[in-house]
């Protein structure tokens, strides 16, 4: 089938990085600058993606592959193929319409993106609080008393509630 197709369609012989040029008797012409074809048999080359503004080039465009973008420092990628850049926040914050805001008490965010999430509720697993949470870090749950064995760390009672963001050192 492939052989039959190639006899009927000379374009199928054009490799990636070229296109089948109808204006030149269907011969294989190299992709012009700033364009690419990632598969063989293409009748046109695709325009290279340009990484401008908040986007920066992570991988240059070649004749056979598109450029790849990521985000400038202070921003992170969102969407397939880094289609958008979103502002970073500090750990312990989340991005709102009004900019980066500290996590409310009882919530945390240990990343520079995403939302503040409620601390883990240790009691749901029948465990106790080993380390209190902060706005940057989740609570750490300790083993239930029945789980303790020689060599395991003992469960310390929860310390008085801290202001969010005051990390226990």
């Amino acid at each position: 089938f492939e052989r039959t197709r190639s006899l009927q369609d000379p374009c199928s012989n054009c490799p990636a990085g070229t296109f089948c040029d109808n204006n030149r008797n269907q011969i294989c012409s190299p992709c012009p600058p700033n364009s690419f074809s990632s598969a063989g048999g293409q009748r046109t080359c695709d325009i290279c993606r340009q990484c401008k503004g908040v986007f920066r080039t992570r991988k240059e465009c070649s004749s056979t592959s598109n450029a790849e973008c990521d985000c400038t420092p202070g921003f992170h990628c969102l969407g397939a193929g880094c289609s958008m850049c979103e502002q970073d926040c500090k750990q312990g914050q989340e991005l709102t319409k009004k900019g980066c805001k500290d996590c409310c008490f009882g919530t945390f965010n240990d990343q520079k993106r995403g939302i503040c999430r409620p601390w883990t509720n240790c009691s749901l697993d029948g465990k106790s609080v080993l380390v209190n949470g902060t706005k940057e870090r989740d609570v750490v749950c300790g083993p239930s008393p029945a789980d303790l064995s020689p060599g395991a760390s003992s469960v310390t009672p929860p310390a008085p509630a801290r202001e969010p963001g005051h990390s226990p050192q």
């Epitope: 240990d110 990343q111 380390v131």
Partner: antibody, heavy 127, light 110 residues
Framework: EVQLLESGGGLVQPGGSLRLSCAAS????????MSWVRQAPGKCLEWVSV????????YYADSVKGRFTISRDNSKNTLYLQMNSLRAEDAAVYYC????????????????????WGQGTLVTVSS | QSVLTQPPSASGTPGRRVTISCSGS????????VTWYQQLPGTAPKLLIY???HRPSGVPDRFSGSKSGTSASLAISGLRSEDEADYYC???????????FGCGTKLTVL
């Protein structure tokens, strides 16, 4: 007992591809973050990538970003690492590691460390 | 060059106490939990300390972890020959959006 068994390592030429697998047993695979960590012969441990079970979020070390892809199949209790455009510096023993802190109850696993490790699979990149 | 700095080597005689340091920054150790791993020759790493200072069950209480500011320490008391291994600190780094390891400290029991 937690068991992690890596496979798929071998000799590959620079620029080539390889897919590593990690078969997990002895725990509820779908409830835990999973990472790949590598170690070049005689060198330090280097974290490569992590995948979360709940939202499928993935993170990568800068050294592999855009070349490696981590994935998981919770129905098969298997973790994968697709490695493309391999370089000489990617040669290492690759370990599959289970994080502590079962999700969704636990919101973040970073406190609990990697409490289960496989024995590793060797990746050699050479022409 | 690792984001977390550990001394390449440490040593001690049996029965004594040795401390291994791990230095980082506010984006990693300063605001995140530190974990420690032991790697015996030719084997996979093993979790030794989690959440800065807590031991998983089965880890002897000779091993203890602590943290102050942007530095962490692992102390091993009552040193034994079987403690001879590489010790790694690790934590999450929010600015890198990933985990980071120190380059390890090789402990020799003299």
């Amino acid at each position: 007992e937690v068991q992690l068994l890596e496979s798929g390592g071998g000799l590959v030429q620079p620029g080539g591809s390889l897919r590593l697998s990690c078969a997990a047993s002895g725990f509820t695979f779908s409830g835990y973050d999973m990472s790949w960590v590598r170690q070049a012969p005689g060198k330090c441990l280097e974290w490569v990538s992590v995948i979360y079970p709940d939202d499928g979020n993935t993170y990568y070390a800068d050294s592999v970003k855009g070349r490696f892809t981590i994935s998981r199949d919770n129905s098969k209790n298997t973790l994968y690492l697709q490695m493309n455009s391999l370089r000489a510096e990617d040669a290492a023993v690759y370990y599959c590691a289970k994080h502590g802190g079962q999700k969704p109850t636990t919101k973040s696993s970073s406190a609990y460390g990697m409490d289960g490790w496989g024995q590793g699979t060797l990746v050699t990149v050479s022409s | 060059q690792s984001v977390l700095t550990q001394p390449p080597s440490a040593s001690g005689t049996p029965g004594r106490r040795v401390t291994i340091s791990c230095s980082g920054s506010s984006s990693n150790i300063g605001n995140n939990y530190v974990t420690w791993y032991q790697q015996l020759p030719g084997t996979a790493p093993k979790l030794l300390i989690y959440a800065d200072s807590h031991r998983p069950s089965g880890v002897p209480d000779r091993f203890s972890g602590s943290k102050s500011g942007t530095s962490a320490s692992l102390a091993i008391s009552g040193l034994r020959s079987e403690d001879e291994a590489d010790y790694y600190c690790a934590t999450w780094d929010y600015s890198l959006s990933g985990y980071v390891f120190g380059c390890g400290t090789k402990l020799t029991v003299l």
